[in-house]
Structure formats: structure tokens, C-alpha cells
């Protein structure tokens, strides 16, 4: 008789990443009988919600339902109907909503309430929407990449199933860059974590991990740019800001009210004699780099060593996966190759920033001007943050791996979040089981 395929015994989970600049929905899938195995969960879909981050809906909360519709409908299509009711849905909001909450808990609650009501209308098992902490964001990002890289598996392999694998159980550090915050998370080498707020203890698959993490709120690429503009306009002699972080010939008008809308620019706030100013690009990497460095206060450190702004940072240890905007920006600039040295990256950034805006627009005709205009700043910011902020060097640069996906799953906090909430990362190593039931009869 012919072998007949039995229905797949699989489970699904949905996580929405409500970031500062946009929301993404991720669908994960795993074999039901292998829930506790490491590396079995994988991403089957990513749907990017059209529009800005949810924190921008303060004045139009009635539009949140429509905003989420396309991606939630996509989830309905991808996940078999029979599985809908048992598929958990989680929404985690990150730094954009942390900033909104800092301004007003009422406004943040209102946005989350409407999001919850909208998501409850779908046939899935909605588990709630919440603002995750920066510590969680860092920790879950670290769990995600190490889970996908097979670092929690106790089985030693003679073959490599994933890129970047050094075939040892040394975990990778995680470097995450968003629009409003950036996270650094890694296991330091025999180093006491001097600041309790930065220390995490995990027991995963029978092994203990002492993890360092910190989330720098306001140091995501978009908020860092707002900070830089607010700092630089303080010393401008008139309403023209000649900015080295934008291409020569680039011009843009900025409203002062928009500049001071975010808590991130509070320290630079002053009464200006104009309501608007014009950015005029001059495209100079070195000057841009110098201006960015002024955002990092390195003069004060109450610990044995710090990153910046008095935040403890142990000596860097091992390899790091740099993902989210670290990857997107470097990918656009064609700088993600393992073979590209830090000196070469700097050289390429100098050339890129110096290119006239008209030339850039022609070369990248398919890219939205809003995003295109900011790659010089973002690339320079990434270099400044990694080198001066986190103290990577030309030598240790080779330990940074710019990662978009691992085994088809996006690097980011969402997978780690779901694994944790669905109790799929056991503290102890699961007992090895016999061969799983055959899916064929």
C-alpha cells in the first residue's frame, strides 16, 4: 500500500514587534512533540505593517484597527483554520512606547488598550499587549540568536548547520539597534557584573548563564539623529544648520516643535528665535563622526569601566551578532561581508557621505528619500556606537557578524520572547527521547 502523509502535528505562535518606527508580525511554527528540543522553532512568515510605529497613533487611535488588519489577515491565511484558536498572539512594544509612557502613561495606555481590543477581534488566542523592558529586549534578542545558532544544544556536531557557527558552545553576544534604543547583551569572561541592573541569570537546557545586558534608550538611530540635531542647532547662528551627516546638496526643513517632541532631546532644549530651521548637507564623515561622539558622555564612570553616560560595560568577550538596524543599514551600504575590515568600512563611509545628494538619488532611485537621506548618518552612527560607545577595536571588529536571518528566522527579540512565554526553553536538558513518531504510515 502507498504511504499516506498524516496531518502535520505542528503548532504556531504569533509575535508582533511594535517598534518605534514600524510594527512587524512574525509567525513561528514547530513540531508539537518536540517543543522542548532546541532549534525546532522556525519563522514561517514576516509581515511588515504599513505605516509608522504604534506610538504615532496617539492622535488617531481609531485607525489602529485598520493599520493591523493586513498582517493579521495574512496570519489567518498562513495558519490552518483548525489551529487558529490555539495559536497564541503576543504583542511587545519597545522603546517608542517607553518614550510615550515617559511623557504620559495615559496616552501609552490608550494606545495599548486600542491595540488589545483590535487584536482580540481575531480568532487567535490573544495573550496581551505590553511594553517590554529594555532588559527583556536585550535578553530575548540574545536568547533568539543563540537558540537559532544551536548554542544551547548539548549535542556536539562535526558539521555546521548554520553560518557563523564555530562549532563550540560559546554563546554569541547580541547587538540590537532600533529606532529609539540599542541593546548590548553578552556573557562576560569571568567578570563580575558591577551593576545589578545589568545582570541577568539564566538556566537554559541544564546550563547556567551570567549575562550582561543594557538598553540605551534614546540611542536608537532615529532618536540619536534627533539628539544630534537638537545639540547642533543650539550653536547655529541662524536657522540654517550645515550638517556633515547629510549629503552635499541635501536640504530639509525641520520644525522646532518636532525636534523637542521627544524626551530624548530634553537636555538640549532651549528657546530658539525661529520655529523652523533648514538642514543643509555638507557630507563630511569625519565631522559627522565628531558630532555624534558629543552624544556619548565618556567623562564620568562610577565603575571599573563604562560604555558611555556612566553605564557599566564589562570587557567585550567572544563573537557578536549585530542585527535589526545594524544589519539593515550595513546591508544597504554593502558592508556586511565578514571580509570587510573596520578601516575599509570607515573608508567606504567617507566616500558614501561625500557623494552629492543628486547623485545618490539617481543611484538609488527605488529607495524612499526619507530613508535614503539618513544612511550617511546611520552608517556613521553605527561605527561611532560600536567603536567609541561599546569599545570595539579594528582588531575585534572581525568578531562582529552582521546578521539578518539565521536558518530563515529573523534575528531579533521576538522569537526569544515567544519561546519564553510558551515555556519552550526548559531550565534542564530534556531527556533524550527515542525517534519521534513517523509522520508516514
Amino acid at each position: 500500500t502507498q504511504n499516506k502523509a498524516l496531518p502535520e502535528n505542528v503548532k504556531y505562535g504569533i509575535v508582533l514587534d511594535a517598534g518605534s518606527s514600524h510594527t512587524s508580525l512574525y509567525i513561528y511554527k514547530w513540531p508539537a512533540e518536540k517543543e522542548n528540543d532546541t532549534g525546532v522553532v522556525h519563522q514561517v512568515e514576516e509581515c511588515r505593517v504599513k505605516g509608522p510605529g504604534i506610538s504615532k497613533f496617539v492622535q488617531k487611535v481609531n485607525e489602529i484597527g485598520i493599520y493591523l488588519t493586513d498582517c493579521m489577515e495574512r496570519a489567518r491565511e498562513v495558519i490552518p483554520r483548525s489551529q487558529h484558536q490555539e495559536t497564541p498572539v503576543y504583542l511587545g512594544a519597545t522603546a517608542g512606547m517607553r518614550l510615550l509612557r515617559m511623557e504620559s502613561e495615559e496616552l501609552a495606555d490608550r494606545v495599548l488598550d486600542v491595540v488589545e481590543r483590535s487584536l482580540s477581534n481575531y480568532p487567535f488566542d490573544f495573550q496581551g499587549a505590553r511594553i517590554i523592558t529594555g532588559q527583556e529586549e536585550g535578553a530575548y534578542g540574545w536568547i533568539t540568536i543563540n537558540y537559532l545558532l544551536g548554542k544551547f544544544s548539548q549535542k556536539t556536531r562535526w558539521f555546521s548547520i548554520v553560518p557563523y557557527e564555530t562549532n563550540n558552545q560559546e554563546t554569541f553576544g547580541a547587538l540590537d539597534l532600533g529606532g529609539a534604543s540599542t541593546q548590548v547583551t553578552f556573557v562576560p569572561q569571568n567578570q563580575t557584573i558591577e551593576s545589578p541592573d545589568n545582570a541577568l541569570q539564566f538556566r537554559l537546557y541544564g546550563k547556567d548563564y551570567n549575562v550582561y545586558t543594557h538598553s540605551f534608550l534614546c540611542y536608537g538611530k532615529d532618536q540619536a539623529l534627533w539628539q544630534k540635531l537638537a545639540k547642533d542647532i543650539q550653536v547655529a547662528s541662524n536657522e540654517i544648520l550645515r550638517d556633515p551627516c547629510f549629503h552635499p546638496g541635501y536640504k530639509k526643513v525641520v520644525n522646532v516643535s518636532d525636534l523637542y517632541k521627544t524626551p530624548c532631546t530634553k537636555r538640549f532644549e532651549m528657546t530658539l528665535p525661529f520655529q523652523q530651521f533648514e538642514i543643509q548637507g555638507i557630507g563630511n564623515y569625519q565631522q559627522c563622526h565628531q558630532s555624534i561622539l558629543e552624544l556619548f558622555n565618556t567623562s564620568y564612570c562610577p565603575y571599573s569601566q563604562c560604555a558611555f553616560n556612566g553605564i557599566f560595560l564589562p570587557p567585550l568577550q567572544g563573537d557578536f551578532g549585530a542585527f535589526s538596524a545594524f544589519y539593515f543599514v550595513m546591508k544597504f551600504l554593502n558592508l556586511t561581508s565578514e571580509k570587510v575590515s573596520q578601516e575599509k568600512v570607515t573608508e567606504m563611509m567617507k566616500k558614501f557621505c561625500a557623494q552629492p545628494w543628486e547623485e545618490i538619488k539617481t543611484s538609488y532611485a527605488g529607495v524612499k528619500e526619507k530613508y535614503l537621506s539618513e544612511y550617511c548618518f546611520s552608517g556613521t552612527y553605527i561605527l561611532s556606537l560600536l567603536l567609541q560607545g561599546y569599545h570595539f577595536t579594528a582588531d575585534s571588529w572581525e568578531h562582529i557578524h552582521f546578521i539578518g536571518k539565521i536558518q530563515g528566522s529573523d534575528a531579533g527579540w521576538t522569537l526569544g520572547y515567544m519561546l519564553n512565554l510558551t515555556n519552550m526553553i526548559p531550565a534542564e536538558q530534556p531527556l533524550s527521547t527515542p525517534l519521534s513518531h513517523s509522520t508516514y504510515v
Epitope: 515617559m102 502613561e105 537636555r267
Partner: antibody, heavy 116, light 111 residues
Framework: QVQLVQSGAEVKKPGASVKVSCKAS????????MHWVRQAPGQRLEWMGY????????TFSQKFKGRATITVDTSASTAYMELSSLRSEDTAVYYC?????????WGQGTLVTVSS | DIVMTQSPDSLAVSLGERATINCRAS??????????MYWFQQKPGQPPKLLIY???NQGSGVPDRFSGSGSGTDFTLTISSLQAEDVAVYYC?????????FGGGTKVEIK
């Protein structure tokens, strides 16, 4: 759980300065603003100003501009309010309160007495 | 500045009876569909305790007998059935705009 613990009572002479501390625990200190509110004996509560612990930016009620300073030590999760050129009418209980727009958590209060 | 006017200044109510306190703002304290209006309870020698936020939402651990209503400029705090432990001074506050301002307080006593 969230806690705000303030420094002890102070007695000051007119013209002097006072610095009150507020140590926070149970949450990420830099995720919320810290406000200062005072209450003179038998009077209504009076908002003085707030700080963004994240970056040290502050905003004051016009009445206290130039005379009050709010600072933070993020490594110690502590906010400070300093009031200079004290006069007898500054005799009050000074409170710190955590919040953006919702003052859900308050310190126990610090009595500052200004007397010659 | 937004001026917050509370009435009455004091109120004596029998145990188990309803107590109603009013607060009027000199201009609307609503923004983005939210009322930035808060009610606090303060007992002697203690810091204020948040009872109601956003005009009508109960603070954490606040008994159900406390409720808030209103929008724009006129707001009400109601204690549906006064208990002995409710004897205190009650303040309204707006945080729509700086400077954040408080009402003059209403002293609630038992008749």
C-alpha cells in the same frame, strides 16, 4: 515593588540652600520622569518641576525657575532637588513622585524648616 | 496656568452615605481623547495616594467605592459608601500642561 525613599528632615537658616534626595527602587530608573511637589503647612500641594533621568533635562514651574535645581545620579537611581535662597515661606514637606502625567508613586516626604 | 477649583472645602457625611466632591478646571484638561485629571487622597503625615487617573480609572488597590467621572472642565469624585478610613483631604490635579496644578483640597469628615 516600586519605592521612593527620601532623605531626612532639615532645618535651614534663611538665605541658605537645601538638597533633598529621593532614592528609587523596583523599576528602571531612567524609564520614568521624577517630579517634585511641596506642601506648606495647611496648604495645597504645589508642583515644582520634574527631571528626565534619562538625560538630565528638566522643566520647572515659573515660580521656582532659577532657584530650584533638579539633578540625578543614575548609577545610584537617585534624584535630588536643591532649593537655594531659602525664605520662611519655603517651610514645607517636599515630595518626589514618579510619573509622566500620572503620579502613582510618592516618596514619604521630607520636612524642610526655614527659621532664623 | 490652569486653575483647579474644588468644592466644597469640607464635607461631613454619615458612615455608609455617599460623598461627592467637585473639581472645575479653568480650561479643558482633555487632550487626544484623554482627560488629564487625577484625584488623590491624603491622610495626616502621609504622602498623597493616587485614587483616580484619567478622570475615571481606579488606581491600583483602590476600593470600588471610589469612582471618578467628568471630562473637559468639570469632574467629580464619588465615594459611594463612606467608611471610617476614608476620613482625609482629597485633591484634584491636572497634568495636561505645565505647570501641573492641584485643587485646594476637600476635607472629608464623618457626620
Amino acid at each position: 515593588q516600586v519605592q521612593l525613599v527620601q532623605s531626612g528632615a532639615e532645618v535651614k537658616k534663611p538665605g541658605a540652600s537645601v538638597k533633598v534626595s529621593c532614592k528609587a527602587s523596583g523599576y528602571t530608573f531612567t524609564d520614568y520622569n521624577m517630579h517634585w511637589v511641596r506642601q506648606a503647612p495647611g496648604q495645597r500641594l504645589e508642583w515644582m518641576g520634574y527631571i528626565v533621568p534619562l538625560n538630565g533635562g528638566s522643566t520647572f514651574s515659573q515660580k521656582f525657575k532659577g532657584r530650584a535645581t533638579i539633578t540625578v545620579d543614575t548609577s545610584a537611581s537617585t534624584a535630588y532637588m536643591e532649593l537655594s535662597s531659602l525664605r520662611s515661606e519655603d517651610t514645607a514637606v517636599y515630595y518626589c513622585a514618579r510619573g509622566g502625567t500620572r503620579f502613582a508613586y510618592w516618596g514619604q516626604g521630607t520636612l524642610v524648616t526655614v527659621s532664623s | 496656568d490652569i486653575v483647579m477649583t474644588q468644592s466644597p472645602d469640607s464635607l461631613a457625611v454619615s458612615l455608609g452615605e455617599r460623598a461627592t466632591i467637585n473639581c472645575r478646571a479653568s480650561e479643558s484638561v482633555d487632550n487626544f481623547g484623554v482627560s488629564f485629571m487625577y484625584w488623590f487622597q491624603q491622610k495626616p503625615g502621609q504622602p498623597p495616594k493616587l485614587l483616580i487617573y484619567g478622570a475615571s480609572n481606579q488606581g491600583s488597590g483602590v476600593p470600588d467605592r471610589f469612582s471618578g467621572s467628568g471630562s473637559g472642565t468639570d469632574f467629580t469624585l464619588t465615594i459611594s459608601s463612606l467608611q471610617a478610613e476614608d476620613v482625609a483631604v482629597y485633591y484634584c490635579q491636572q497634568t495636561k500642561e505645565v505647570p501641573y496644578t492641584f485643587g485646594g483640597g476637600t476635607k472629608v469628615e464623618i457626620k
